[in-house]
């Protein structure tokens, strides 16, 4: 598939009707992050998709109770992840299924990079790269 295909909704227009922000988040492990989707229309529920890497196929994001929360207020949908972990790394997409047409619209994605060094070896490697 062409790389641009990954950012198109089924109608073919890139990221139409949904604006996702920010495009990139880098935070240390344990922090709380929020990502937002702004929609032209509030007529449809928003769900969130996730994939680890750009080439992989997305999956429905299952919200971990007490750690992940989604909220929707008219034209704004927000995903909040508390206490981020390395396994949360990946690209998050909001998706809206319109009530009246059943069309699906998708945001362009927010890449989450969880920072931090889990081992001394990784820290040494980072220092070597800096040098």
């Amino acid at each position: 598939a062409r790389s641009e295909d990954r950012y198109r909704n089924p109608k073919g227009s890139a990221c139409s009707r949904i604006w996702q922000s920010p495009r990139f988040i880098a935070r240390k492990r344990g922090f709380t992050v929020k990502m937002h989707c702004y929609m032209n229309s509030a007529s449809g529920n928003v769900s969130w998709l996730w994939k680890q890497e750009m080439d992989e196929n997305p999956q429905q994001l299952k919200l971990e109770k007490g750690r992940m929360e989604e909220s929707q207020n008219e034209s704004l949908a927000t995903l909040t992840i508390q206490g981020i972990r390395f396994e949360d790394n990946g690209i998050y997409f909001c998706q809206q299924k319109c009530n009246n047409t059943s069309e699906v619209y998708q945001g362009c994605g927010t890449e989450l990079r969880v920072m931090g060094f889990s081992t001394l070896a990784q820290l040494k490697q980072r220092n070597t790269l800096k040098d």
Partner: antibody
Framework: EVQLVESGGDLVQPGGSLRLSCEAS????????MNWVRQAPGKGLEWVSG????????YYADSVKGRFTISRDNSKNTLYLQMNSLRAEDTAVYYC????????????????WGQGTMVTVSS | SYELTQPPSVSVSPGQTARITCSGD??????AYWYQKKSGQAPVLVIH???KRPSGIPERFSGSSSGTMATLTISGAQVEDEADYYC???????????FGGGTKLTVL
Amino acid sequence: EVQLVESGGDLVQPGGSLRLSCEASGFTFSNYGMNWVRQAPGKGLEWVSGISGSGGTTYYADSVKGRFTISRDNSKNTLYLQMNSLRAEDTAVYYCANLLLWLGYHGDGFDLWGQGTMVTVSS
Amino acid sequence: SYELTQPPSVSVSPGQTARITCSGDALPKKYAYWYQKKSGQAPVLVIHEDSKRPSGIPERFSGSSSGTMATLTISGAQVEDEADYYCFSTDRSGNHVVFGGGTKLTVL
């Protein structure tokens, strides 16, 4: 019609090789990750391997890693499984499947299986 | 490697409720899916994303999930529901698909 059709199953000796094919029709093949799943006689379903829509990323069960290779030709709407160093325990019906838990690039998804092709590894 | 654990068999009388469980450490973070598999046939998806029922699947099939356990419930089981049932999901990376060992449902 949306369908998957497998072929290539056969009787092969231990240590031998075989290539399975799965031809897809009725949907935009390149948008979807695809999988091979097998069922040995009298046993349960076992996921064998998966591949992303572009073919750039592949995944394998530990039981076949290093022996099996999954690939796809999106211009031919075809999925492949190259099986080398076959063992008796690889004897199974092999299914090509689009599993709903991997969505397409557009966030849509559906569940679709082929009819299966039998691979028998025996001397 | 990651595993999903199911009971090997469940038996109920027609009209009774059958419950089939599936446990796995990643299930708080990953959705469970359920297949019905009859001999000689391709699997049929009966539940996706823990509790959603595909169109064409009878209402007596339902799913739920709590913590590390997912459950498939067949309310008012019928003779035609006799089959093997498999839960499946992914590991925490999302990249490796894992099937449970399967549960043989007998409707006596």
